[in-house]
């Protein structure tokens, strides 16, 4: 069966939107008005993995681009990257673990925990126009809470 996907945008808990500022650069900044069109539309695929009521394994692809968020160990540190894939083979139900995030819903907010690196989360900085990254702390200065907005296909 084909993998189930939905299109959505994400904003962090400070209402910063995610935009592409270059081919491999995902940054978070406040947008308003017409500029909202710049925000990235994700194709969120529901993939194989450990699942519970509040934890759902997903892959985050960029709609109509052959790019996925992935988590790799780079120089001993878990690192978030945008990775090119062969569009003929993705998305798929059994995604490699580096592409899988546990979507965790808490108090109407979402966290995205790396399946490859437990307790490492998709994060944004308090500062404007900084890269989205993989952070190893929750509840600190960096932001790990997001809201999701559905986008019609």
């Amino acid at each position: 069966a084909p993998v189930r996907s939905l299109n959505c945008t994400l904003r962090d808990s400070q209402q910063k939107s995610l935009v592409m500022s270059g081919p491999y650069e995902l940054k978070a900044l406040h947008l308003q008005g017409q500029d909202m069109e710049q925000q990235v539309v994700f194709s969120m695929s529901f993939v194989q993995g450990e699942e519970s009521n509040d934890k759902i394994p997903v892959a985050l692809g960029l709609k109509e681009k052959n790019l996925y968020l992935s988590c790799v160990l780079k120089d001993d540190k878990p690192t978030l990257q945008l990775e090119s894939v062969d569009p003929k083979n993705y998305p798929k139900k059994k995604m490699e673990k580096r592409f899988v995030f546990n979507k965790i819903e808490i108090n109407n907010k979402l966290e995205f925990e790396s399946a490859q690196f437990p307790n490492w989360y998709i994060s944004t900085s308090q500062a404007e126009n900084m890269p989205v990254f993989l952070g190893g702390t929750k509840g600190g200065q960096d932001i790990t809470d997001f809201t999701m907005q559905f986008v019609s296909s």
Partner: antibody, heavy 116, light 112 residues
Framework: EVQLLESGGGLVQPGGSLRLSCAAS????????MSWVRQAPGKGLEWVSG????????GYADSVKGRFTISRDNSKNTLYLQMNSLRAEDTAVYYC?????????WGQGTLVTVSS | QTVVTQEPSFSVSPGGTVTLTCGLS?????????PGWYQQTPGQAPRTLIY???NRSSGVPDRFSGSILGNKAALTITGAQADDESDYYC????????????FGGGTKLTVL
Amino acid sequence: EVQLLESGGGLVQPGGSLRLSCAASGFTFSTYAMSWVRQAPGKGLEWVSGINTGGGSTGYADSVKGRFTISRDNSKNTLYLQMNSLRAEDTAVYYCAKDWMATTPWGQGTLVTVSS
Amino acid sequence: QTVVTQEPSFSVSPGGTVTLTCGLSSGSVTTNNYPGWYQQTPGQAPRTLIYNTNNRSSGVPDRFSGSILGNKAALTITGAQADDESDYYCALYMSSGSNNAVFGGGTKLTVL
């Protein structure tokens, strides 16, 4: 203050190899894609190569594909360009730059001269 | 192989407005090419003016603006000044197929 400092250039014979380094400071290196751009004497700019944050995706200009390899060490805040099978036409000042599409600031560059 | 095209030279009067363009030998430039504009004066390292179509780099005066005009990327300089006399390069990302970027040949801008 964001700073990029290129090193490793010099005189090399055709067919030889060089490894360029770029030491980055003043920003969180591991969260940025990086690139190399070169400029031959009296010529325009040429994008050479780019690498994403984790090193999983790279890109190369057609003129260097198969001869040059870009890499990075996020623990050392350093970008590299391994250049093999060098040709006279690779003679240029090599700049490293933040982001795939080279955003400010640029370093001062390192000169590579390929000559017998 | 796709070529990035720029006007070889352009002149503008002090205080005037000039628009430099950046096109593709085949096809149209879009925001998915992440157009960038770079200024270089002789003997100096390049300076990024505009990235991602229309984002000004820090410290760049708002006299410089980027846009898409028709099927090309454009750099507009309003209120041209003597020290704007430089070489201007654009660069375009060439899609995830080739996964590279290409600079145009540059435009030599004269302010007279």
